[in-house]
Interface confidence: low
């Protein structure tokens, strides 16, 4: 069971990143699915290595004082959402914006029907060029 | 099937990074090989988790305006090269240069004879001290 | 065999990061253990994917000139410690400090009784908020 999906620009104002099965994507079988273009949902309980990479372009003067944060989050059936992993990068002083890349990854137990998704502080800053931003998992 | 190789400084002007089976490297068997010191080639079709880490030292004034970009690329037999993953970091204002580290990783299907390699915008900026820059894969 | 442990603030002056089985941690069985809150120790020989993520907050003026370095280190029975992976990030000019995240990961052969741990140049700069700093491994 494995998946690798590719970032997609979205006009939605939500902080949850959008993904697509496009380009050189992976979807090994129907035991993992991309739901609503926003979350990877697994059908089998087990340990999974889950990862995300986010490249963004921001400028200190044009952004809020708070850093750019990417969060890998879990929603299990009947449970509250929870943060699994986070990374934070202070905005660049480069103009018009400075690019930076974040990589998250870790081993977590998922229940049947559990979904994982990626949140960012400002989706408009995310880079969607080939290979820059992606999201995936593999079952151990 | 798994491999982990270690960066090697090169006098070549190519943007493809060079690697060696040295230090605490891994080469599990002959189903994965390091070819010409530049690419990991697999003999078996399947899903692989492929990763690379690149540490570099650059300065904004001494570098081009474009950011430092590391790309994980795929060359399959009879196909064009393609980019699997990229990460970008704007150059530091630190002098003489500021160090930054990039990590790339994802799950991809590889065909028999497929090769993966790592490209960077400026190989002269890459750090080759122990553990700073490495490249590997594992078959799921 | 898999583990994922969560960072813990420590009053110790050591550069070795401290970890805990808390929050959404993973400890698959007793073939991998967290020893003294500082190292993951495995009982079985084999290839392991080992990873660490460290988020830190630092300022160029308040820090030493040297960059912030995170190192993934190995201690095998009867052998000297050795560095497996390192990442380096120059300190931010943001005030009071600028956050940055580092991710390390690679495939390594571990012997029975081998331990892996994470070293940083300044543990007081490490961020311990939910999901920011973690450490783990999985046996291939």
């Amino acid at each position: 069971i494995a998946a690798h999906v590719i970032s997609e620009a979205s006009s939605k104002t939500t902080s949850v990143l959008q993904w697509a099965e496009k380009g050189y994507y992976t979807m090994s079988n129907n035991l993992v699915t991309l739901e609503n273009g926003k979350q990877l949902t697994v059908k089998r309980q087990g340990l999974y290595y889950i990862y995300a990479q986010v490249t963004f372009c921001s400028n200190r003067e044009a952004s809020s004082q708070a850093p750019f944060i990417a969060s890998l989050c879990l929603k299990s059936p009947g449970r509250f959402e929870r943060i699994l992993l986070r990374a934070a990068n202070t905005h660049s002083s480069a103009k018009p914006c400075g690019q930076q890349s974040i990589h998250l990854g870790g081993v977590f137990e998922l229940q049947p029907g559990a979904s994982v998704f990626v949140n960012v502080t400002d989706p408009s800053q995310v880079s969607h060029g080939t290979g820059f931003t992606s999201f995936g998992l593999l079952k151990l | 099937i798994a491999a982990h190789v270690i960066s090697e400084a090169s006098s070549k002007t190519t943007s493809v990074l060079q690697w060696a089976e040295k230090g605490y490297y891994t080469m599990s068997n002959n189903l994965v090989t390091l070819e010409n010191g530049k690419q990991l080639t697999v003999k078996r079709q399947g899903l692989y988790y492929i990763y690379a880490q690149v540490t570099f030292c650059s300065n904004r004034e001494a570098s081009s305006q474009a950011p430092f970009i590391a790309s994980l690329c795929l060359k399959s037999p009879g196909r064009f090269e393609r980019i699997l993953l990229r990460a970008a970091n704007t150059h530091s204002s630190a002098k003489p240069c500021g160090q930054q580290s990039i990590h790339l990783g994802g799950v991809f299907e590889l065909q028999p004879g497929a090769s993966v390699f790592v490209n960077v915008t400026d190989p002269s900026q890459v750090s080759h001290g122990t553990g700073f820059t490495s490249f590997g894969l594992l078959k799921l | 065999i898999a583990a994922h442990v969560i960072s813990e603030a420590s009053s110790k002056t050591t550069s070795v990061l401290q970890w805990a089985e808390k929050g959404y941690y993973t400890m698959s069985n007793n073939l991998v253990t967290l020893e003294n809150g500082k190292q993951l120790t495995v009982k079985r020989q084999g290839l392991y994917y080992i990873y660490a993520q460290v988020t830190f907050c630092s300022n160029r003026e308040a820090s030493s000139q040297a960059p912030f370095i995170a190192s993934l280190c190995l201690k095998s029975p009867g052998r000297f410690e050795r560095i497996l992976l390192r990442a380096a990030n120059t300190h931010s000019s943001a005030k009071p400090c600028g956050q940055q995240s580092i991710h390390l990961g690679g495939v390594f052969e571990l012997q029975p009784g081998a331990s892996v741990f994470v070293n940083v140049t300044d543990p007081s700069q490490v961020s311990h908020g939910t999901g920011f700093t973690s450490f783990g491994l999985l046996k291939l």
Epitope: H128, G129, T130 | A66, P67, I69 | -
Partner: nanobody
């Protein structure tokens, strides 16, 4: 605004030659990979050739030895020199690029979904 404009197409006899041009505006072409694609009537669009920011090139097997891609950074233009043309080369030829705040390094790709910006195309007809 990023724009690509192809020119140089036309009717040519088998064995003849044409030189296609792809003129870029709105960005500095030398920083990016450029791909040439073609779409024959009733067929899917396919990659023909590409050139990276550093000048490395790739070609699909059916055109190797006959087609040559090149770039003139001063003119912000990429060329496709097509020699020994065959009837099966008949198609609309497009150039495309992916200028996403940074360049692609030495690699280039002719998978069409990798490219964000496309020209309007130029028709090449090889017939006696």
């Amino acid at each position: 605004e990023v724009q690509l404009v192809e020119s140089g197409g036309g009717l040519v006899q088998p064995g003849g030659s044409l030189r296609l041009s792809c003129a870029a505006s709105g960005f500095t072409l030398e920083y990016y990979a450029i791909g040439w694609f073609r779409q024959a009537p009733g067929k899917e669009r396919e990659g023909v050739s590409c050139i990276s920011s550093e000048g490395s090139t790739s070609y699909t097997d059916s055109v190797k030895g006959r087609f040559t891609i090149s770039r003139d950074n001063a003119k912000n233009t990429v060329y496709l020199q097509m020699n020994s043309l065959k009837p099966e080369d008949t198609a609309v030829y497009y150039c495309a690029t992916d200028p996403d705040r940074g360049f692609l390094g030495s690699s280039c790709d002719t998978q069409s979904h990798q490219y964000d910006y496309w020209g309007q195309g130029t028709l090449v007809t090889v017939s006696s």
